[in-house]
Interface confidence: low
């Protein structure tokens, strides 16, 4: 209207998508009667009547707002529910009396975008490209208004830089009116960027203020030529025979070149190519001393056909040879002396130990073991252990059996066995001596003999308990070229109902047990036998 004062700026109302906007009609009583108001939406300068207030009662006009408007605050406020981006416009209320006045409200709508999704270029980027190449794409979906994107490398924001960094952003409008932003980062990368972390950040506004969301960090495959190849050996440190050793070629280029590993032939001094597994790794399993030597790696770039050679690397597989003991099978008379000597070779300094096989007791720290005034108990196994103290687990051993000449020696002289008549007894008898004795029984039954070690024998007898047997008892006799010896087993009847918890066992090597079945067993407690020879 000519001469009228300029309209004041509209009141700003900010809401998030999906929430309710409260549009308060700011007309004072002097400007109009709030019980008689018309509400309009203004879009592209076109007014559309959307709501009427008459005598404080509201009435929606047909159209896009029909279902979403209601009156609040005794008619002074119009509530617009489920706000959409399309609702971002001016709304005005117009009082009818005493004269036509209007009040304008600018509705601003906001929606936080979803978490930014970043995708790295899977094909990677060569360092020698002439212009910026696509590094990654950042997508921020369903935001309003359009969020701003900032790209970061190693935590620092990236700026447009001619021929170096280019950020190409575009947006699409979804049917909901929300925006999806896509931003492509293009850059010229250098070798040092192979570990660089890139991410994008979306900046957006909400009624509560400014906010931002960050994507995950990504690295991009960077391709650069190989300048150096080298060998790596696993495990690191001292190697020993039996280890699994992996020799692999490494290069500072990406992709790595085609590798081959060669070893210098000690006779011809020529480098001979070794056979690697499918992954280009030379696996030595188990490693042997013959694997020791000078290795080198060749890297061949199949694109340029440029070949690079590594520095040679000396590999030492430490070893201990077979252990030799002399004499190898000593036989001695009681009372005599014996010197046992142990020998072995190694790539490192060796330590020797002599142990008693049966007990594991260390008898001597050194290669020579001297035994004096030999008793029959000194017979049996002695083990020499040759070890490299600087390399745990690197050792070899050799067992030698010492035989002491003598007549049979019984494990027990006599023993009481509890039995029940008509039981089948399992009796055992053990003797040792050199030469190794044989065992016989004084009663009929099923007997079997087991050689426990070069000087020791165990005989077992299955026999039925009869009144005669109870009377006579059982004898076992061991004999060799140098004499004989006897053990006696006394059989005593036991009533099953009067058995006490410990009355079913006897001392010594045999036990006799009574069971509900008419059978009893007398079994030997066996010692673990040493192996004739074993190596570490």
């Amino acid at each position: 209207v000519p001469g009228e004062a300029e309209q004041p700026a509209p009141e700003l109302v900010e809401v998030e998508v999906g929430s309710t906007a409260l549009l308060k009609c700011g007309l004072s009583q002097s400007q109009g009667n709030l019980s008689h108001v018309d509400w309009f939406s203004v879009h592209k300068e076109k007014r559309t009547l959307i709501f009427r207030v008459r005598q404080g009662q509201g009435q929606s006009e047909p159209g896009e707002y029909e279902q979403r408007l209601s009156l609040q605050d005794r008619g002074a406020t119009l509530a617009l529910t489920q706000v959409t981006p399309q609702d971002e416009r001016i709304f005005l209320c117009q009082g009818k009396r005493p004269r036509s006045q209007e009040y304008r409200i600018q509705l601003r709508v906001y929606k936080a975008p979803e978490e930014p999704n970043i995708q790295v270029n899977p094909l990677g980027i060569p360092v020698n490209s002439k212009e910026p190449e696509e590094v990654a794409t950042c997508v921020g979906r369903n935001g309003y208004p359009i969020p701003q994107v900032i790209w970061y490398k190693n935590g620092r924001p990236l700026k447009e830089e001619k021929n170096r960094v280019h950020i190409q952003s575009s947006q699409t409008v979804e049917s909901s009116g929300l925006y999806t932003l896509q931003s492509i980062l293009k850059a010229q990368l250098v070798k040092e960027d192979k570990d660089a972390q890139f991410y994008c950040e979306l900046n957006y506004r909400l009624p509560s203020g400014n906010h931002m969301k960050e994507s995950r960090e990504v690295t991009v495959p960077v391709f650069y030529p190989t300048e150096k190849v080298w060998l790596e050996v696993e495990p690191v440190g001292m190697l020993k025979e039996g280890d699994r050793v992996e020799i692999r070629c490494l290069a500072d280029g990406n992709p790595p070149p085609h590798f081959s590993i060669s070893k210098q032939n000690p006779s011809t001094r020529e480098a001979e190519e070794e056979t690697t597994n499918d992954n280009g790794v030379l696996v030595l399993e188990p490693a042997r001393k013959e694997h020791s030597g000078r290795y080198e790696c060749q890297g061949l770039d199949l694109d340029t056909m440029i070949s690079l050679l590594s520095e040679p690397q000396e590999l030492l597989v430490n070893y201990v040879s077979d252990v030799r003991v002399s004499p190898a099978a000593p036989e001695r008379q009681e009372g005599s002396s014996l010197t046992l000597t142990c020998e072995a070779e190694s790539s490192q300094d060796l330590e020797f130990q002599w142990l008693r096989e049966e007990t594991g007791q260390v008898l001597e720290r050194g290669p020579v073991l001297q035994l004096h005034d030999l008793k029959r108990e000194a017979g049996g196994g002695y083990r020499c252990v040759a070890s490299v103290p600087s390399i745990p687990g690197l050792n070899r051993t050799q067992l030698v059996n010492v035989a002491i000449f003598g007549p049979p020696w019984m494990a027990f002289k006599e023993r009481k066995v509890w039995v029940k008549e008509n039981m089948v007894l399992n009796l055992s008898c053990e003797a040792s001596g050199h030469p190794r004795p044989t065992i016989s029984w004084n009663v009929n039954g099923t007997a079997s003999e087991q050689d426990q070690d070069p000087q020791r024998v165990l005989s077992t007898l299955n026999v039925l308990v009869t009144p005669e047997l109870l009377e006579t008892g059982v004898e076992c006799t061991a004999s060799n070229d140098l004499g004989k010896n006897t053990s006696i087993l006394f059989l005593e009847l036991v009533n099953l109902t009067t058995l006490t918890p410990d009355s079913n066992t006897t001392t010594g090597l045999s036990t006799s047990t009574a069971s509900p079945h008419t059978r009893a067993n007398s079994t030997s407690t066996e010692r673990k036998l040493p192996e004739p020879e074993s190596r570490g």
Epitope: P255, N277, D278, N279, E285, L302
Partner: antibody, heavy 117, light 107 residues
Framework: QVQLEQSGPGLVKPSETLSLTCTVS??????????WSWIRQHPGRGLEWIGY???????YHNPSLKSRITISVDTSKNQFSLKLSSVTAADTAVYYC?????????WGQGTLVTVSS | EIVMTQSPATLSVSPGERATLSCRAS??????FAWYQQKPGQAPRLLIF???TRATGIPARFSGSGSGTEFTLTISSLQSEDFAVYYC?????????FGQGTKVEIK
């Protein structure tokens, strides 16, 4: 536990291209530890090694088939593929994908590909 | 390429008996060698690698030996589930090559 799952058509027309894909689960192709191979077996016959691909894209093909083979890898999908062009009835076989190291410990289930019009 | 030759082509054995399969390489392949078992409609199964090392889960009745050009697979006591075709393979050189197979059948 590493598993290899094969996919692709069982029927191909002569002179067309055979395409198979092998998807690896329980382990990453990109780990760089293994090669990934294709092997085939003609009906009632023995095994014929076709070629391998490494995660970096480097390949080696059986010279007898070389000019017709394309092996590719998609590390983002953890899968590798075989294309054999200009097929004839002689290419009818069960095709296997396998993980190569010291021998082939893990195999796909096999795909019978018949070349017929 | 390295040619792998298996013998015999067919081996007829009774359950519980011992089976010995041979494979010869046309040139030395050190111990870069594997044995596989294949049953109808199934993919091959790795039995032995490194010429003598049993793969995970393979019973002790399977054993491998040899180095260079001559290799042997021994099944000490054949079980019903062992009747199958057995292939040898070298992984010393490219291309990888397989033997033509030995069928172990019930006698």
């Amino acid at each position: 536990q590493v598993q290899l799952e094969q996919s692709g058509p069982g029927l191909v027309k002569p002179s067309e291209t055979l395409s198979l894909t092998c998807t690896v689960s329980g382990g990453s192709i990109s780990s760089g530890t293994y090669h990934w191979s294709w092997i085939r077996q003609h009906p009632g016959r023995g095994l014929e090694w076709i070629g391998y691909i490494y995660y970096s894209g480097s390949t080696y093909h059986n010279p007898s088939l070389k000019s017709r083979i394309t092996i590719s890898v998609d590390t983002s999908k953890n899968q590798f593929s075989l294309k054999l062009s200009s097929v004839t009835a002689a290419d009818t076989a069960v095709y296997y994908c396998a993980r190569g190291g010291d021998g082939y410990r893990y195999w796909g289930q096999g795909t019978l590909v018949t070349v017929s019009s | 390429e390295i040619v792998m030759t298996q013998s015999p082509a067919t081996l007829s054995v009774s359950p519980g008996e011992r089976a010995t399969l041979s494979c010869r390489a046309s040139q030395s392949i050190s111990n870069n060698f594997a044995w596989y078992q294949q049953k109808p409609g199934q993919a091959p199964r790795l039995l032995i690698f490194g010429a003598s090392t049993r793969a995970t889960g393979i019973p002790a009745r399977f054993s491998g030996s040899g180095s260079g050009t001559e290799f042997t697979l021994t099944i000490s006591s054949l079980q019903s589930e062992d009747f199958a075709v057995y292939y040898c393979q070298q992984y010393n050189n490219w291309p990888r090559t397989f033997g033509q197979g030995t069928k172990v059948e019930i006698k």
